[in-house]
Interface confidence: medium
C-alpha cells in the first residue's frame, strides 16, 4: 500500500530509506539508487536520520558541486541550505559528500568507496 | 514531521516489524519495563539479516535474552532456549545479552546500555 516500503527498506516519517552495508563509489551509489526507483539521500534537516544517530558510519548522499551554478546542489537541482553543514564553504568542490547521521559531513574523493543511503518519499 | 504507516509515530518500520530506536541508556530490567510500557517487547533478533540491519542502525543495545545464572541456559522473554552464540558466557556476572556490532555478547544486567523495542505487525 502507499504507506509501505519495499522489503529491506526502512520506513520513517513517511520516507523509505535503503541503508547499504556495501561500499561503493559515489557514482555507483547514485546508479544503484536510481535502479531502485529512488535517489541518493537528500536531507531536509540534520535530524532526518535521528533513528540512526548513534551510527559511526559515513554514507554517500546526493549532493554534488555544480560548476555551472557555482553551488552545491541536490540531485533534484535544489541548492544546499547554508544551515545544514556549517563547514560546507570549505568543502573541496571536486569531491562528493559523505554524511554521518549524527549530523556531520565529510568531503571525500568521489572515487572513494563508502556506504550509501537511498531515499523514496511515500507521499 | 508527517506520520505514515502502521507503527507508532517516531518508530521505524522494517520487514514487517516496528522498532523503537532508543537513545536513552537503561539497565536491562528498566529497558524491559520501558518497552512493556510502549506495548512492545525488548528487542528480539530473529535472524542474521535482522542482526546485520540493527547493527547498522545502532552500535549496541540490549536484547530480550537473559539467564538466571551462568549455570542456566540463555532464554528469550517467552522462556524458549536461545540458540545463537553469546560471547563471554563463561563470566558468571554477565547474565543479560547485548547486540554489539553484528555479534551477541553477555553483559552485566545492571549496566546502563541503549535499548530498542520491537513489535511485529
Amino acid at each position: 500500500d502507499c504507506c509501505s516500503c519495499q522489503e529491506k527498506w526502512v520506513g520513517y516519517r513517511c520516507n523509505c530509506y535503503f541503508i547499504s552495508s556495501e561500499q561503493k563509489t559515489w557514482n555507483e551509489s547514485r546508479h544503484l539508487c536510481a535502479s531502485q526507483k529512488s535517489s541518493l539521500l537528500q536531507l531536509q534537516n540534520t535530524d532526518e536520520l535521528d533513528f540512526m544517530s548513534s551510527s559511526q558510519q559515513f554514507y554517500w548522499i546526493g549532493l554534488s558541486y555544480s560548476e555551472e551554478h557555482t553551488a552545491w546542489l541536490w540531485e533534484n537541482g535544489s541548492a544546499l541550505s547554508q544551515y545544514l553543514f556549517p563547514s560546507f564553504e570549505t568543502f573541496n568542490t571536486k569531491n562528493c559528500i559523505a554524511y554521518n547521521p549524527n549530523g556531520n559531513a565529510l568531503d571525500e574523493s568521489c572515487e572513494d568507496k563508502n556506504r550509501y543511503i537511498c531515499k523514496q518519499q511515500l507521499i | 514531521a508527517r506520520h505514515c504507516g502502521h507503527c507508532p509515530e517516531e518508530w521505524i518500520t522494517y520487514s514487517n516489524s516496528c522498532y523503537y530506536i532508543g537513545k536513552e541508556r537503561r539497565t536491562w530490567e528498566e529497558s524491559l519495563l520501558a518497552c512493556t510500557s510502549k506495548n512492545s517487547s525488548l528487542l528480539s533478533i530473529d535472524n542474521e539479516e535482522e542482526m546485520k540491519f540493527l547493527s547498522i542502525i545502532s552500535p549496541s543495545s540490549w536484547i530480550g535474552v537473559f539467564r538466571n545464572s551462568s549455570h542456566h541456559p540463555w532464554v528469550t522473554m517467552n522462556g524458549l532456549a536461545f540458540k545463537h552464540e553469546i560471547k563471554d558466557s563463561d563470566n558468571a556476572e554477565l547474565n543479560c545479552a547485548v547486540l554489539q556490532v553484528n555479534r551477541l555478547k553477555s553483559a552485566q544486567c545492571g549496566s546502563s546500555i541503549i535499548y530498542h523495542c520491537k513489535h511485529k505487525l
Epitope: T90, T93, D107 | -
Partner: antibody, heavy 118, light 107 residues
C-alpha cells in the same frame, strides 16, 4: 603512485625572500588543496596556508598573512611558497602537502630545509 | 585559534604493547581530528582522519577515537616501525592547528 617532489635546501640571508616549489605526480593538483606546513628545529608542525589550484583561492594562518604567498601552476602541476623578509625565526623545514578532503593532509612532500643566516 | 594539546611529549613502550596517545582541543572540534606519524628522517604520513577513519594503506593496528574536545590514537600491537612522533591536528576551523607531538620510543 602519488608523490610530491620539493625543491632542494636553501641557505638565505636575513631580509631576503625564498621561493620553494613542489611538483605533484600521480594526481592532478586541480583536484586537491595544496597546503604548506612548517617545522622549526625541534618544534612541532605549523600550518601556513593553502591554495585551491582550480580557482586560486587561498587561506593563510593570520600569523603568516603578508609574509607567505602560496601560488600554483596547474600546467606544470606545481605549487609554490614564497616567504619574504626572512629572519632566523624562519629557519625551518617546509612541507608541501596535498589533500582531497578539506580538513586533512593526505600526501606530504619530503620537506625543504630553509636556513636563514648571515 | 583552536589550541591542540598533547600532554605527553614522550612515551616509552615495549614491542607488542598497546599504546594510547591523547590529544585535547581548546573547544569542541566535532570530530574533525586527524593523526599523523613523523619518522625520525622527517617523513610524514597521514594515519587517521575524522577521528577514526583509517587512511588507505595504514595498518589496522592503528585506531582512533574520541569526541568533543578529547581524542586518542591507539596502536594495538606496537612494532619497531611505529617508532616515531605522532601529531594530532584539528580541521574544524581555520587556521588548522597541530598538537605539539608525542614521541614514541622503545623501552
Amino acid at each position: 603512485e602519488v608523490q610530491l617532489q620539493q625543491s632542494g635546501a636553501e641557505l638565505v640571508m636575513p631580509g631576503a625572500s625564498v621561493k620553494l616549489s613542489c611538483t605533484a605526480s600521480g594526481f592532478n593538483i586541480k583536484d586537491t588543496y595544496m597546503h604548506w606546513v612548517m617545522q622549526r628545529p625541534e618544534q612541532g608542525l605549523e600550518w601556513i596556508g593553502r591554495i585551491d589550484p582550480a580557482n586560486v583561492n587561498t587561506n593563510y594562518d593570520p600569523r603568516f598573512q603578508g609574509k607567505a604567498t602560496i601560488t600554483a601552476d596547474t600546467s606544470s602541476n606545481t605549487a609554490y611558497l614564497q616567504f619574504s623578509s626572512l629572519t632566523s625565526e624562519d629557519t625551518a623545514v617546509y612541507y608541501c602537502v596535498g589533500g582531497r578532503g578539506h580538513t586533512w593532509f593526505a600526501y606530504w612532500g619530503q620537506g625543504t630545509l630553509v636556513t636563514v643566516s648571515a | 585559534d583552536i589550541q591542540m594539546t598533547q600532554t605527553t611529549s614522550s612515551l616509552s613502550a615495549s614491542l607488542g604493547d598497546r599504546v594510547t596517545i591523547s590529544c585535547r582541543a581548546s573547544q569542541d572540534i566535532t570530530n574533525y581530528l586527524n593523526w599523523y606519524q613523523q619518522k625520525p628522517d622527517g617523513t610524514v604520513k597521514l594515519l587517521i582522519y575524522y577521528t577514526s577513519r583509517l587512511h588507505s594503506g595504514v595498518p589496522s593496528r592503528f585506531s582512533g577515537s574520541g569526541s568533543g574536545t578529547d581524542y586518542s590514537l591507539t596502536i594495538s600491537n606496537l612494532e619497531q616501525e611505529d617508532i616515531a612522533t605522532y601529531f594530532c591536528q584539528q580541521g574544524n576551523t581555520l587556521p588548522y592547528t597541530f598538537g605539539g607531538g608525542t614521541k614514541l620510543e622503545i623501552k
